[in-house]
Every structure is written in structure tokens, then in C-alpha cells.
């Protein structure tokens, strides 16, 4: 058996595909926090669902793949995802201190439905997550207002009818929510004083003003000749999580970089003896992304078929046949700013001191590319396109 | 599709122990709660017992308190009602029946093993000197 | 032990025609969740019990819409908008609210 990784890399790949073909802006996404949503789909469906949401996280090798598996195999492999999901959730949340990374899974259930102890014990064991009962049936506009304050609380943030009006009726019986925070310390920080207003090229004709924030500092950096692109690490405090962004040399650049992009490559990009410490001109916005997706429809287009029908088998969550996730939603949220661990001598040093010069320029004022990883699991936290302020 | 299906019942002389078994099929055993009920001739129902799915909780009417004991084996998808010092007001059919899911309250928290459905055929269990 | 009574204890009903049998606790079963923790079973002449109705007026898989429940607190009902002749058997109440669960003493239906 493989880990969940080449799985969910490729699932990452084929979810931001997906997204991109949907969204004209911005594309921001969580694969953790997908991940972990489904693992908690997963531990409440059997049979050919489950089979079929498995396979999105988990891959095995060929030979094993292909022959009929015993129902103890099944449920052994399954232990597994959501074991590995947990350590995950536990390791990723290790060194909090250092920064605010919120993930929140919540399932709200139609109040009249039996759900089954087991499930209700197992996803707050591995997901920490709970079931919210909810008046579908006689209140479903009152049950829409209520979701959508939960998910505000969940990252302080104003939503606008994140389910709007109607959305919900008296037939919905489960609804799915995966909200994912980050918010961290730069391991340098980038000195307020020389964030400056600058445009942002959306395309060759049309600009948007950002505030540019600017460091020249020691950065993992490497050219990739093949796409035209440069790419940087941007460690945070601890050097535990990075964020690295896929810059492409052209403002009109970033298509041909995606057209050519693939797991293994953003693997191999990313490895340590690919890119090398090099000083950078680093200028990149001070962003505030935030999407909301319904799941539903994505994950359909990318394999997962029977989860959101009414055949889905849910036999593990409830007795009760008929039951699905009617909505599955997940709202990502990511705040760039300068803040940072204090400067010290020898450490990342303020422009105006350093000649620019002799720094390589990584000036992120076109579309780009950035994702998130965390070192140790390895994991991949943020996916994102910033194409528009 | 769901089938349970006890055994173990007969004539036994008061004081005497009797183990039931209920066999389950066509679900996933380990993940329901799982009851006892009784129904002496003629009579109404009764509780007996409840326990959890992990076996872990365990719950009993106060008649059959200290001598009966409710107890599974999930590897082997059975339910099990050990029941000792039996008396004459023992006598009764014995269904097994699977938990039908918890009710959920405010996040997280649930009442779990209220409602029994399906039933087993059940199995007459006599005491009788 | 909550002690639940039923009335009546005999019920001579005509195909068609509705029915109504009710259900009293001794004390209270709405729990602080809101719910009421009633429910109904039959058990059919030499059948094992199903049950019908839970939570007061849920109906159980299956179950057809001509059965509904109703009533909350300490008293409670369940209808049959038009019998027919498969639904004759005993019906039972039971409170579902804390161990042990305890049963009505039954309401025979019959066709007439």
C-alpha cells in the first residue's frame, strides 16, 4: 500500500483543473482540508462509494489494486486513510504557536435522522469534527442562517449568504462544511516601511493598484528555463510551513505554466537538491484570499460520482437508507501580511541597505501561482492562482 | 438484508444459568448498538439490557440487574445474553434487536440506543422446575 | 420507572375507517433537545414487533403514510387514517427518554 500522498497529489492536480475551467479569478484551495472533508465522508459510506472517494486519497500498487478485496481488507484499508488523516491533522497543528492554522469540519444533519454512535464517536476521534442537528424540515430557511454564522465564526470573516436564499429546503438531510485559516509569521519579516502601492498587471492592457510588499533576503530559489518561470520558498517561522510561489516570466505567462504542470513536476520543483539558496529581490502583494466552493459539483467532474447521488450508500453514518452530503462546501482562507520574526544581524536585511543589484528580481505583480506546504507530513495546505486582487 | 436470529432458549430449572446468542447478518455488526426485549406468554413487551457498539456501555432493566449479562463479539457478529440465577417470571420469547441510530443533539453530543428495529424471531426461553 | 398507559386496550375497527390509539406517561418525555422520546411498535399475530413511529411522529423506514403520530409531553396518539386488514395486531407505546425503556400494556386492533 502507498501513502496518501501520490494519490492526493494528483487529486490536488486535477481538483485545481477543475476549479480553474470554473473561475475566471482567483483559485484558492485547501487540498488538507479536502482531504480531511472526505475522510469524514469516507468513514460514514460503504461499498462502491466509499471504494470511489478512496481511491481520490489512497493509491496502491497495481497488482493488489486489481484483485476483489475481503470486507476486512476494506475496512482495514479505510482504518488506515483515517489514521493517516488523523496523524496528519495532529502533525500539521503541532507547532500552532507559531502560527494560526484553523481547520474546522463540520456536518449538520437533519434533527429527525438517526445517525449511528459509532459514526458520530469515530468522526470526532479522528476529524474533530461534530454533527450539528438542524430543522431541515420545518425550519430550512432558519437551518441556511445557521450554517452560515457557523462558517463565519469559523474564520471572523463576513459571508455573504455563503448558501443563499432557497438553497436549502426540506429534503436536504446532510450538509458539509471544511473551513480552512492561515495566518503566519514570516521566518523574516518585510519592514511595513517599504510596502509601497504598485499596479498589479492582470493582463498586457489591464492593472489593478496592490500594496507590493519588498524583502531582499536568502530564499530557495531556482529558474525553470522550460516554463519560462522562476520559482521561490518563502519560509515561515520554524521553517515548518513554506509558501512558494511559481512566478512566470511573462504577465501573460501563467497558462503556458499550467498547461505543462504535473504532479511529479511540482514535486520534483520543490525538492531540496532542486532549488538553491540564492539572494532574492522578493516583491510580493499583501494578499487576503478567501473562495468558498461548492465540492459537489467539482468533485463529480473529477471521478466522484455516486457520494452526492440518492444511491450513495451511507450505511455507515445512518441505518437509514436515502441519506447523501447534498452540499459539500469548503471556504479557504489565507492573510499575507509583513509580519514576521524581528530581523536580527546577519538575517534577512532591509532594501535600502542591500544593493538590488545583486539580487535576483521575483516581482510578483502578475498572475502567479503559490502553494502552501508543510514540511514534515509533507503536505500540501494551500493550492492557489492569484491572477486579481 | 438485515437478519437476526437468536437461539439458545429451552427448559431450565430455576437457578440455573442459560447463555442466548443472536446471530447478525446483512450490516455492519460493529457499528450498531445492540438490545434485548422479552415478551412473556401472553403478555406485553419488556426491556432487558442494551450495549453500546464497542461493548463498552452497557445498560439493564432493574429486574434482571446482577444476573444477567449483555455482552458481543464483533469479530464474530454475535450478541450474546448470559443469564444466571433464572427464576420462574424469566420465562419469556427473547428478541434481539438492532439499534436503529442515535438522535444528535448540540454539536457533538447525542442520545444513542433508543429505538429497536429490525427484531429477531426470537427464542423461548421456559424456567421451570 | 416511567410508567406508560394505554387506551384502549381493545380496538374493533372497519376496513377503511380511521383509527385512534393513545398513549400516556407518567411523567414528561421531551428532553431538552426538543424531541419527544416516544415511540410506537406493532407486533403482527405470531410476528416479531417493528416498529412504526419514533421520536413522537417520525415515521420508521417503510412505513406507510396512512400511520402518523402525534401528541407531545406526557400524551400522545397514533392515527391509521383508513385501517386495512393487514394493520390488526398489537400496538405498543414505549418511552425511549431514560433506562430502562419501558412499554404500554398494549392495544389490540381488530377488523370488525
Known amino acids: 500500500m502507498d501513502s496518501l500522498g501520490t494519490a492526493a497529489t494528483q487529486f490536488l492536480f486535477d481538483l485545481f483543473k477543475e476549479l480553474n475551467k470554473t473561475n475566471d479569478g482567483n483559485v484558492f484551495f485547501s487540498p488538507v482540508g479536502i482531504s480531511t472533508a472526505i475522510g469524514m465522508i469516507i468513514l460514514g459510506t460503504r461499498g462502491a462509494t466509499a471504494s470511489e472517494l478512496q481511491k481520490v486519497l489512497y493509491t496502491e500498487q497495481g497488482t493488489e489494486s486489481s484483485r476483489i478485496k475481503s470486507e476486512e481488507e476494506e475496512i482495514e484499508k479505510r482504518e488506515e486513510i483515517h489514521h493517516q488523516l488523523q496523524m496528519l491533522l495532529t502533525e500539521i497543528s503541532k507547532f500552532s504557536n507559531d502560527y494560526d492554522l484553523i481547520i474546522s469540519n463540520r456536518l449538520f444533519g437533519e434533527k429527525t435522522y438517526l445517525f449511528l454512535q459509532k459514526y458520530i464517536d469515530y468522526v470526532e476521534k479522528y476529524y474533530h469534527a461534530s454533527l450539528e442537528p438542524v430543522d431541515f424540515v420545518n425550519a430550512a430557511d432558519e437551518s441556511r442562517k445557521k450554517i452560515n454564522s457557523w462558517v463565519e465564526s469559523q474564520t471572523n470573516v463576513k459571508v455573504k449568504d455563503l448558501f443563499p436564499e432557497g438553497s436549502l429546503n426540506s429534503s436536504t438531510k446532510l450538509v458539509l462544511i471544511n473551513t480552512v485559516y492561515f495566518k503566519g509569521l514570516w521566518d523574516r519579516e518585510f519592514k511595513k516601511e517599504h510596502t509601497k502601492e504598485e499596479d498589479f498587471w492582470l493582463n498586457k492592457n489591464l492593472s489593478k493598484p496592490v500594496q507590493m510588499m519588498a524583502l531582499c533576503s536568502s530564499f530557495n530559489f531556482t529558474f525553470l528555463e522550460d516554463l519560462q518561470a522562476k520559482i521561490v520558498g518563502i519560509p515561515y517561522k520554524n521553517n515548518d510551513i513554506s509558501m512558494f510561489v511559481l512566478l512566470p516570466n511573462d504577465i501573460d505567462g501563467l497558462e503556458k505554466i499550467m498547461d505543462k504542470m504535473s504532479p511529479e513536476k511540482l514535486v520534483e520543483w520543490t525538492s531540496p537538491g532542486h532549488l538553491e539558496q540564492r539572494r532574492v529581490d522578493l516583491r510580493l502583494p499583501r494578499l487576503q484570499v478567501e473562495e468558498t466552493y461548492d465540492l459537489e459539483p467539482v468533485l463529480e467532474a473529477v471521478g466522484i460520482h455516486s457520494a452526492f447521488s440518492e444511491h450513495a450508500d451511507y450505511s455507515g453514518m445512518s441505518a437509514r437508507s436515502g441519506l447523501h452530503a447534498q452540499n459539500f462546501l469548503h471556504r479557504s482562507f489565507l492573510v499575507v501580511t509583513e509580519e514576521g520574526v524581528e530581523a536580527t544581524a546577519g538575517t534577512g536585511v532591509g532594501l535600502k541597505v542591500s544593493s538590488a543589484a545583486s539580487c535576483e528580481l521575483v516581482h510578483c505583480n502578475h498572475p502567479f501561482l503559490f502553494f502552501i506546504r508543510h514540511r514534515e507530513s509533507d503536505s500540501i495546505l494551500f493550492f492557489g492562482k492569484f491572477s486579481s486582487p | 438484508q438485515v437478519q437476526l436470529q437468536e437461539s439458545g432458549g429451552g427448559v431450565v430449572q430455576p437457578g440455573r444459568s442459560l447463555r442466548l446468542s443472536c446471530a447478525a447478518s446483512?450490516?455492519?455488526?460493529?457499528?450498531?448498538?445492540m438490545h434485548w426485549v422479552r415478551q412473556a406468554p401472553g403478555k406485553g413487551l419488556e426491556w432487558v439490557a442494551v450495549i453500546s457498539y464497542d461493548g463498552s456501555n452497557k445498560y439493564y432493566a432493574d429486574s434482571v440487574k446482577g444476573r444477567f449479562t449483555i455482552s458481543r463479539d464483533n469479530s464474530k457478529n454475535t450478541l450474546y445474553l448470559q443469564m444466571n440465577s433464572l427464576r420462574a417470571e424469566d420465562t419469556a420469547v427473547y428478541y434481539c434487536?438492532?439499534?436503529?441510530?442515535?438522535?444528535?443533539?448540540?454539536?457533538?453530543?447525542?442520545?444513542?440506543?433508543?429505538?429497536?428495529?429490525?427484531w429477531g424471531q426470537g427464542t423461548l426461553v421456559t424456567v421451570s422446575s | 420507572d416511567v410508567v406508560m398507559t394505554q387506551s384502549p386496550l381493545s380496538l374493533p375497527v372497519t376496513p377503511g375507517e380511521p383509527a385512534s390509539i393513545s398513549c400516556r406517561s407518567r411523567?414528561?418525555?421531551?428532553?431538552?433537545?426538543?424531541?419527544?422520546?416516544l415511540g410506537w411498535y406493532l407486533q403482527k399475530p405470531g410476528q416479531s414487533p417493528q416498529l412504526l413511529i419514533y421520536?413522537?411522529?417520525i415515521r420508521a423506514s417503510g412505513i406507510p403514510d396512512r400511520f402518523s403520530g402525534s401528541g407531545s409531553g406526557t400524551d400522545f396518539t397514533l392515527k391509521i387514517s383508513r385501517v386495512e386488514a393487514e394493520d390488526v395486531g398489537v400496538y405498543y407505546c414505549?418511552?425511549?427518554?431514560?433506562?430502562?425503556?419501558?412499554f404500554g400494556q398494549g392495544t389490540k386492533l381488530e377488523i370488525k
Open positions: 446483512g450490516f455492519t455488526f460493529s457499528s450498531y448498538g
Open positions: 414505549m418511552q425511549a427518554l431514560q433506562t430502562p425503556y419501558t
Open positions: 411523567q414528561s418525555l421531551l428532553h431538552s433537545n426538543g424531541h419527544n422520546y
Open positions: 434487536a438492532r439499534d436503529l441510530g442515535a438522535v444528535i443533539a448540540v454539536a457533538g453530543t447525542s442520545t444513542p440506543y433508543n429505538w429497536f428495529d429490525p
Open positions: 421520536l413522537a411522529s
